[in-house]
């Protein structure tokens, strides 16, 4: 996360680190004792479940036990819109035990469409600079807002690449954004409860003023999530 402050896992108990061969690859969000929500592109290189592990319950990357993964379910790839459908569900081998530092985040209600300038939060262990060095060892957080998709698709920005199944978030002047290593983590909105409204997906650089972060819009995939759950009951 670029333009940030340190976070405590008490504040974001649904945040997990998704690791391959003990290396942090992506963030993710706990939805219930069995399921973690993340981005499909995290698994482009490796889809085998055996070397993937989930770490929950700590704000420090290396300091918490790893959980075995039973299944990785990725939505169908759409070659017409290769950046669309960047969503995946990980089923854990054993259910999580919830505590002060391990808790689920809510899915949005089906009519939750957020207006531009709505305040949101991002978190992650990703790079803190665009051309950036390394992952952060500690969980970082930042406040952003919904950026109007018309503005996001402007000629000096993403030129129409942001589809209706995506959303943009950042701050108008830039400087606050998700970055490499934050992928799969939640874009969060607080109403009565915290909701995961977006999944860290893609962007050009990190923190540029005209190219904010682009997120998978979770409300666009509720049906897919519910169908996966139903099929896995």
């Amino acid at each position: 996360v670029v333009g940030v402050e340190e976070a405590s896992v008490d504040s974001w108990p649904w945040q997990v680190s998704i690791q391959y061969d003990k290396q942090h690859v992506c963030g993710g969000s706990i939805l219930d004792p069995h399921w973690v929500l993340t981005a499909a592109h995290c698994f482009r290189k490796h889809t085998d479940v055996f070397n993937w592990k989930v770490r929950a319950g700590s704000d420090k990357l290396g300091s918490f036990p790893s959980l075995a993964v039973a299944k990785i379910i990725i939505i169908e790839f759409n070659p017409m819109y290769p950046k669309d459908n960047d969503i995946a569900l990980m089923k854990l081998q054993f259910p999580l035990t919830f505590s002060g530092t391990v808790r689920p985040i809510c899915l949005p209600f089906f009519d939750e469409e957020l207006t531009p300038a709505t305040p949101l939060w991002i978190i992650g262990w990703g790079f803190t600079k665009q051309n950036g060095g390394k992952m952060s060892d500690i969980l970082l957080q930042a406040s952003v807002q919904v950026i109007d998709s018309t503005r996001c698709n402007a000629d000096d920005a993403y030129q129409g690449e942001v589809t209706e199944k995506m959303m943009c978030a950042g701050i108008p002047e830039g400087g606050v954004d998700t970055c490499q290593g934050d992928s799969g983590g939640p874009l969060m909105y607080q109403s009565d409860q915290w909701h995961v409204v977006g999944i860290v997906s893609w962007g050009y650089g990190c923190g540029g003023p005209s190219t904010p972060g682009v997120y998978t819009k979770v409300s666009a995939y509720l049906n897919w999530i519910y169908n996966v759950w139903k099929a896995e009951l």
Partner: antibody, heavy 115, light 112 residues
Framework: QVQLVESGGGLVQPGGSLRLSCAAS????????MSWVRQAPGKGLEWVSA????????FYADSVKGRFTISRDNSKNMLYLQMNSLRAEDTAVYYC????????WGLGTTVTVSS | DIVMTQTPLSSPVTLGQPASISCRSS???????????LTWLQQRPGQPPRLLIY???KRFSGVPDRFSGSGAGTDFTLKISRVEAEDVGVYYC?????????FGGGTKVEIK
């Protein structure tokens, strides 16, 4: 003012198809999920289908799954219901309704499936 | 699917008197986000339905304050404190917590 106007209803034979439209005005259409609800003659209300504001997620009642398709065109402020393989039991007044609370309704359009 | 059961089927009321309609769901309507998406709709004869109450007890804009909603979990009630002639029609409860969305069978309010 906020308004929903349905059209496209009519008489169709069993097995036939029909496409209903709902024109929305007076609000930011893309910010709202939309639903279709139907009411058979002399009967209660039955939810048919819903679609999220982006059009990304669609939901259906079991009675219409695989036969009906909900869609929307946010650039035109239009909601659609494509109805295929129509049956006599699909005969009803079809309403479109706004949002997760169904807070605005159209006047409805009548679909009659009969030979 | 969540089954919504309304009672009574019909409620003959004297003008100016209260009326009460009950709605019971086959499972809890509390969404994972903590909200309870239970709405009440009114359908006057020959008209489309109209939203009265959402999230158990919130009155929709323009709805007279003689209408009130209450309840929690699986048991909900719509009350009309003093029935007026324009209140005649069928009242439906509906849950929007879980797909498929489902309605109660309706309660007909008529004047004695």
């Amino acid at each position: 003012q906020v308004q929903l106007v349905e059209s496209g209803g009519g008489l169709v034979q069993p097995g036939g198809s029909l496409r209903l439209s709902c024109a929305a005005s007076g609000f930011t259409f893309s910010s709202y999920a939309m639903s279709w609800v139907r009411q058979a003659p002399g009967k209660g209300l039955e939810w048919v289908s819903a679609i999220t504001g982006s059009g990304g997620s669609t939901f259906y009642a079991d009675s219409v799954k695989g036969r009906f398709t909900i869609s929307r065109d946010n650039s035109k402020n239009m909601l659609y219901l494509q109805m295929n393989s129509l049956r006599a039991e699909d005969t009803a007044v079809y309403y479109c309704a706004r949002g997760g609370n169904l807070d605005v309704w159209g006047l409805g359009t009548t679909v009659t499936v009969s030979s | 699917d969540i089954v919504m059961t309304q009672t009574p089927l019909s409620s003959p009321v004297t003008l100016g008197q209260p009326a009460s309609i009950s709605c019971r769901s086959s499972q809890s309507l509390v969404h994972s986000n903590g909200n309870t998406y239970l709405t009440w709709l009114q359908q006057r004869p020959g008209q489309p339905p109209r939203l009265l109450i959402y999230k158990i007890s919130k009155r929709f804009s323009g709805v007279p304050d003689r209408f009130s909603g209450s309840g929690a979990g699986t048991d909900f009630t719509l009350k009309i404190s003093r029935v007026e002639a324009e209140d005649v029609g069928v009242y439906y409860c509906m849950q929007l917590t879980q797909f498929p969305l489902t309605f109660g069978g309706g309660t007909k309010v008529e004047i004695k």
